[in-house]
């Protein structure tokens, strides 16, 4: 395997970790593969300090997550535990809200406008951040 | 200058198997994700494998699941497509295609012909 | 999947002319769009991506425009290596896909 020492070109670094910032949008599972692409996942926030540092970049814009809820319990892609992890919902969230008229509840997290967590249709195209952190041995597969 | 080299194209019997290989030179092969996309003669493009970087993450077109294999050893800078179970419509001219910024196919190799025919 | 319906399929026009192809995405791609440039034998060569942004080193007379579903690419002043085949292909969803593409020939 090889480690990446240094983030990749546009990408910012903070705290040991890389973040990409999407200037346009896709749905949740598009943006998570994406991310995958890039040997990256789409953001997992871990503390109020990544909050803030993610929060700045994105501005007042709606902004995918890697926190969803299409399999049952909420979930980090990177399996982070949710019940004793960090949450900055927005107050009554999340409400698997079946009022849109898309069909289904809402499944994937996003950033608002300020800053703090709503559930949304996971098809809705909205931006969103990737992360990859440093110092961690990427796993190549060997070949066949 | 990027540089893309496909081989390992040629004439293969229906069932059969074939390896492709791509030699990339000029750019951070490690760092940048590959494709393969094929054109059948006379036809339009049709993407048909990515893999990151690591080699971690790949990609497949369903009409190709199961019988193509993509992959890469990035000490030797190459790009690989195992073809296996090879049928008359995978006749094509094989590209291999860097990803670029914001994964656009930013560049190509010249292509590598696959004929399968009994 | 993702489909995508280039128009026309083939254009004749002189040089000098202005064409417009245009591509349509079955169901909306925002501005995950780019278009390429094939000459007979030959790799495809990117134009623009980002369905508006020129690639560094491709000649201004390009360009692109559209979002969500319509698309069209702009040739502004046709030159003689120009008369080839064109296609769109959209990065929004994999599998990523392209259009049949349209060639633009010598009237």
């Known amino acids: 395997g090889s480690e990446r020492t240094c983030c990749p070109v546009n990408w910012v670094e903070h705290e040991r970790s890389c973040y990409w910032f999407s200037r346009s949008g896709k749905a949740w599972a598009d943006a998570d593969n994406y991310c995958r692409l890039e040997d990256a996942h789409l953001v997992v926030v871990t503390s109020w300090e990544e909050q803030k540092f993610v929060q700045h970049h994105i501005g007042p814009v709606n902004t995918w997550m890697g926190l969803h809820d299409q399999n049952g319990p909420w979930k980090w892609v990177d399996g982070t535990d949710y019940e004793t992890g960090f949450k900055n919902w927005r107050p009554e969230q999340p409400d698997d809200w079946y009022g849109h008229g898309l069909g289904g509840g809402e499944d994937c997290a996003h950033f608002t406008d300020d800053g703090r967590w709503n559930d949304d249709v996971c098809q809705r195209p909205y931006r969103w951040v990737c992360e990859t952190e440093l110092d961690k041995a990427s796993q190549e597969p060997p070949l066949l | 200058e990027v540089q893309l080299l496909e081989s390992g194209g040629g004439l293969v019997q229906p069932g059969g198997s074939l390896r492709l290989s791509c030699a990339a030179s000029g750019f951070t092969f490690r760092n940048s994700a590959m494709n393969w996309v094929r054109q059948a003669p006379g036809k339009g493009l049709e993407w048909v494998s990515a893999?990151?970087?690591?080699?971690?993450?790949?990609f497949y077109a369903d009409s190709v699941k199961g019988r193509f294999t993509i992959s890469r050893d990035n000490s030797k800078n190459t790009l690989y497509l195992q073809i296996n179970s090879l049928r008359a419509e995978d006749t094509a001219v094989y590209y291999c295609?860097?990803?670029?910024?914001?994964?656009?196919?930013?560049?190509w190799g010249q292509g590598t012909l696959v004929t399968v025919s009994s | 999947d993702i489909q995508m319906t280039q128009s026309p399929s083939s254009v004749s026009a002189s040089v000098g002319d202005r064409v417009t192809i245009t591509c349509r995405a079955s169901?909306?791609?925002?501005?995950?769009l780019a278009w390429y440039q094939q000459k007979p034998g030959k790799a495809p060569k990117l134009l623009i991506y980002?369905?508006?942004s020129l690639q560094n080193g491709v000649p201004s007379r390009f360009s692109g425009s559209g979002s969500g579903t319509d698309f069209t690419l702009t040739i502004s002043s046709l030159q003689p290596e120009d008369f080839v085949t064109y296609c769109c292909?959209?990065?929004?969803?994999?599998?990523?896909?392209f259009g049949q593409g349209t060639k633009v020939e010598i009237k």
């Open positions: 295609a860097k990803c670029g910024r914001e994964q656009w196919l930013d560049y």
């Open positions: 169901q909306n791609i925002t501005s995950w």
């Open positions: 893999i990151s970087g690591s080699g971690g993450t790949t």
């Open positions: 980002s369905a508006s």
């Open positions: 292909q959209q990065a929004n969803s994999f599998p990523w896909t």
